[in-house]
Interface confidence: medium
């Protein structure tokens, strides 16, 4: 499924994102447009043989197991499959884990370059939340 | 337990398409990458590409561009490759592995033999 | 793409003795190499992977070693039923690549 912005930001403040450890829901819908250019089932292989999944681009070396990246450590307990699903609740889930683990949204490469300082709150004005 | 279970033999003229299907049972199939891979005499095992069946997601080598193209079918747990302008070339054993990064599990391949 | 260079392209060996396999990468794969044997007219079948890790079912007499550019794959004691080609496979980068083979044979 490819996320309208409003859409996506609508279903990101339903479960919960808006301001989830003081990211407002701009930062989030800006790190999704930059990450998979709002496509739930975006995919993209690095060099270190991991793939990232889904919406939020999250990382099969940490975060999900695809069966196939040596040394997963699969911190959130998912099939990494279960991330390119049109419900987005088992990014929104996975990407709640990873904002808390000490790096905040740097863990997100896309939301570094092109969100961070700048003015995010333009990636959901207009929309009816 | 795992298996995966090709389609048979086929014999094609060349410019035509074929279909080769590669069943799968005894896991979730949506989770796991599909890869194909092609062997001929003399030329050793060759990479095709991978398709996540669960989102459709697929690379390919850019060698097979164009020459394949990946489906799959998650409600018969089914991936299926079509090679397309078939030429000699294209006569080889094709098989599906699961893409764990090593190929534990194989198909019994498919012969695509190319002849006018 | 990582090119895999297989050695020797063909071994002769007698039932019992020990033999080494080698498989080289063109460039650094950590370890990320996997090794299959393959009958004549049969599927290729998962010896070893992550270059020293025995896949289910393997007999002990099988083994790999190395990391980065140099593989083995080592058979201690080969029997009857091992002989037939040996491939590389490297999953360190896309596109996945195999090695050209060595077919061990009876001398």
């Known amino acids: 499924k490819v996320f309208g912005r409003c859409e996506l930001a609508a279903a990101m403040k339903r479960h919960g994102l808006d301001n989830y450890r003081g990211y407002s829901l701009g930062n989030w819908v800006c790190a999704a447009k930059f990450e998979s250019n709002f496509n739930t089932q975006a995919t993209n292989r690095n060099t270190d043989g991991s793939t990232d999944y889904g919406i939020l681009q999250i990382n099969s070396r940490w975060w999900c197991n695809d069966g196939r990246t040596p040394g997963s450590r699969n911190l959130c307990n998912i099939p990494c499959s279960a991330l390119l699903s049109s419900d987005i609740t088992a990014s929104v889930n996975c990407a709640k884990k990873i904002v808390s683990d000490g790096n905040g949204m740097n863990a997100w490469v896309a939301w570094r370059n092109r969100c961070k300082g700048t003015d995010v709150q333009a990636w959901i004005r207009g929309c009816r939340l | 337990q795992v298996q995966l279970q090709e389609s048979g033999a086929e014999v094609m003229k060349p410019g035509a398409s074929v279909k080769i299907s590669c069943k799968a049972t005894g896991y979730t199939f949506s989770t796991y990458w599909i890869e194909w891979v092609k062997q001929r005499p003399g030329h050793g095992l060759e990479w095709i590409g991978e398709?996540?069946?669960?989102?459709?997601?697929?690379y390919y080598n850019e060698k097979f561009k164009g020459k394949a193209t990946f489906t799959a079918d998650t409600s018969s747990n089914t991936a299926y490759m079509q090679l397309s302008s078939l030429t000699s070339e294209d006569s080889a054993v094709y098989y599906c592995?699961?893409?764990?990064?090593?190929?534990?599990?194989w198909g019994q391949g498919t012969t695509l033999t190319v002849s006018s | 793409d990582i090119e895999l260079t297989q050695s020797p392209a063909t071994l002769s060996v007698t039932p019992g003795d020990s033999v080494s396999l080698s498989c080289r990468a063109s460039?650094?794969?950590?370890?990320?190499l996997h090794w299959y044997q393959q009958k004549s007219h049969e599927s290729p079948r998962l010896l070893i992977k992550y270059a020293s890790q025995r896949a289910s079912g393997i007999p002990s007499r099988f083994s790999g070693s190395g990391s980065g550019t140099d593989f083995t794959l080592s058979i201690n004691s080969v029997e009857t039923e091992d002989f037939g080609m040996y491939f590389c496979q490297q999953s360190n980068s896309w596109p996945r690549t195999f090695g050209g083979g060595t077919k061990l044979e009876i001398k």
């Open positions: 592995a699961r893409g764990d990064g090593y190929y534990c599990y």
């Open positions: 460039q650094s794969i950590s370890n990320n």
């Open positions: 398709i996540l069946p669960g989102s459709g997601s697929t």
